[in-house]
Interface confidence: low
């Protein structure tokens, strides 16, 4: 009679996440008696999966009945995979002996590939926020994917960035993969409602990647442009002046009124108006009682946003005139090295 | 036995490229992947990038990208590293290594290649 | 990128001592840490790959051990040839990354 032979007809398998795995093992005859044993891997550090003489093996199933005496199936089904299992499995012939069983034949191995999703991408910017025209880091991850093979892809509202390097680790062979990746984006004024998206696509997705966001909101800071205006007289020795804070992102706004370098008054923005790009405008205004100036007042409007360092702009007005020949002045000086006007 | 044969020492203006071959032997030169590492003078060890030689991966040092380009040849089952806009820092030994594919350790070296940049 | 930290930077011992080499990395990198020793004028010599494993050839003196972010090398009873320089290399993340290196003088 022909020697026993072992047959594993599946070379691999390829099995999802939380799925049953069918690895099929056949003898071609009923001699020599003896049981057979599952294993992951060969040699000395061998796994042992199934054992059909004893042992208590939880999540391993066997396919047909070990109990009947002509039966030659050993194939075994193993339950709620995970990318740990992933590995070259053993069907193993042992002939009875005493006091132990003796290896007699193995099959030659079925390889048992995991497909893991990718975790949702996660995306986190920079922790402080930047101006526009400045370059910011987002980072992108997504974590326990299985075969390696991914595509990750930035954009911003909608259009794909070039400028990121993406790392898979570990590098080597691995159960799962984490992958890691910094693009480079560039801010403008109006990236208050822009989104940055990290896209991840891999084969257990079936063609739905997917997203990680994040809004540059957080991100980005505009600073304020400042216009300081003299308003028509309300009364004889009465000018209002009113300061226009433009365009400005985020909210926290706090602006000081300065008569002569002298602090006049110091009030938080509440009632803002809001700009289609998402900034902010705001306006506070100053009546000045020209009859209580002897000379010339220099008025300036400060603006401290966002914990920045103040910016302002100053406006002269003569006292020396008549209130109502400056009425409709509405010539603004500069400051110095202390201004900023972004237009 | 395992060998790593590399070219011999150069001397190159700043501004200038080099090419630093690798010959390997004694073992399946497309079942490995091919190092790169440099050691500047008195300095510890940098790596630069590696090419899988089986299919021509090929990775780089961020430091080095646009500077270095390693290809290789099967049929020779040489590597190759060259490194172009030369300057004096980067007069170093350069090492090929042979890395396994699992753990990525490096467990052949070459003798190394001493690259002087001086003008 | 990962950041691989040695520590001492050198090391001064006697023939016959036991010496314990410190690397630290920056994240977990699970067991993808390898050991070299390098003598001078001569190519890095790999010692330990995976952290713990001793590759062939290489004296039973040597060991490492350690996972995630802590590893060591340790040499029992230092023979006169085990002075050298040693780095550690992760391999778990590109770009791949050596330690400073450790000088063992005698002392």
């Known amino acids: 009679e022909e020697e026993l032979q072992v047959i594993q007809p599946d070379k691999s398998v390829l099995v999802a996440a939380g799925e049953t795995a069918t690895l099929r093992c056949t003898a071609t005859s009923l001699i020599p008696v003896g049981p057979i044993q599952w294993f992951r891997g060969a040699g000395p550090g061998r796994e042992l999966i199934y054992n059909q003489k004893e042992g208590h093996f939880p999540r391993v199933t066997t396919v047909s009945d070990l109990t009947k005496r002509n039966n030659m199936d050993f194939s075994i089904r193993i339950g709620n995979i995970t990318p740990a299992d992933a590995g070259t499995y053993y069907c193993v012939k042992f002939r009875k002996g005493s006091p132990d069983d003796v290896e007699f034949k193995s099959g030659a191995g079925t390889e048992l590939s995991v497909r893991a999703k990718p975790s949702a991408p996660v995306v986190s910017g920079p922790a402080a926020r930047a101006t526009p025209q400045h370059t910011v880091s987002f980072t992108c991850e997504s974590h326990g994917f299985s075969p390696r093979d991914i595509t990750l892809k930035w954009f911003k509202n909608g259009n794909e960035l070039s400028d990121f390097q993406t790392n898979v680790d570990p590098v080597g062979e691995s159960v799962s993969y984490s992958i890691h990746s910094t693009a480079k984006v560039v801010l403008t004024r109006e990236d208050v409602h822009s989104q940055v998206i990290c896209e991840v696509a891999h084969v257990t997705l079936q063609g739905d990647p997917l997203r990680g966001t994040a809004n540059l909101s957080e991100t980005i800071r505009v600073p304020p442009t400042l216009e300081v205006t003299q308003q028509p007289v309300r009364a004889e020795n009465q000018v209002n002046v009113t300061c226009q804070v433009r365009k400005f992102y985020p909210q926290r706004l706090q602006l000081t009124w300065l008569e002569n370098g002298n602090v006049s008054r110091t009030e938080t923005a509440s009632t803002v108006t809001e700009n289609k790009d998402g900034t902010y405008n705001w306006m506070s205004w100053l009546l000045v009682n020209v009859s209580a100036h002897r000379d010339d007042v220099k008025l300036t409007c400060q603006v401290e946003h966002d914990g920045q360092p103040a910016v302002s702009k100053s406006h002269d007005l003569k006292v020396s005139a008549h209130p109502k020949e400056q009425g409709s002045n509405t010539a603004a000086e500069n400051t110095g090295s202390n201004e900023r006007n972004i237009y | 036995q395992v060998q790593l044969v590399q070219s011999g020492a150069e001397v190159k203006k700043p501004g200038a490229s080099v090419k630093v071959s690798c010959k390997a032997s004694?073992?399946?030169?497309?079942?490995?992947?091919m190092h790169w590492v440099r050691q500047v003078p008195g300095q510890g060890l940098e790596w630069m990038g590696w090419?899988?030689?089986?299919?021509?991966?090929?990775k780089y040092s961020q430091k080095f990208q646009g500077r270095v380009t390693i290809t290789r040849d099967t049929s020779a089952t040489t590597a190759y590293m060259e490194l172009s806009s030369l300057r004096s820092e980067d007069t170093a030994v350069y090492y090929c290594?042979?890395?396994?594919?699992?753990?990525?350790?490096?467990?052949?070296w070459g003798k190394g290649t001493t690259v002087t940049v001086s003008s | 990128d990962i950041q691989v930290t040695q520590s001492p930077s050198s090391l001064s011992a006697s023939v016959g001592d036991r010496v314990t080499i410190t690397c630290r990395a920056s994240?977990?990198?699970?067991?993808?840490l390898n050991w070299y020793q390098q003598k001078p004028g001569k190519a890095p010599k790999l010692l330990i790959h995976?952290?713990?494993s001793l590759q062939a050839g290489v004296p039973s003196r040597f060991s490492g051990s350690g996972s995630g972010t802590d590893f060591s090398l340790t040499i029992n009873s230092l023979q006169p040839e085990d002075f050298a320089t040693y780095y550690c290399?992760?391999?778990?993340?590109?770009?791949?990354?050596f330690g400073g290196g450790t000088k063992v003088e005698i002392k």
């Open positions: 290594a042979r890395g396994d594919y699992y753990y990525y350790y490096m467990d052949v």
């Open positions: 004694g073992y399946t030169f497309t079942s490995n992947a």
């Open positions: 090419i899988k030689a089986g299919n021509a991966e090929i």
């Open positions: 994240q977990s990198i699970s067991d993808f």
């Open positions: 995976a952290a713990s």
């Open positions: 290399q992760q391999s778990y993340s590109t770009p791949l990354s």
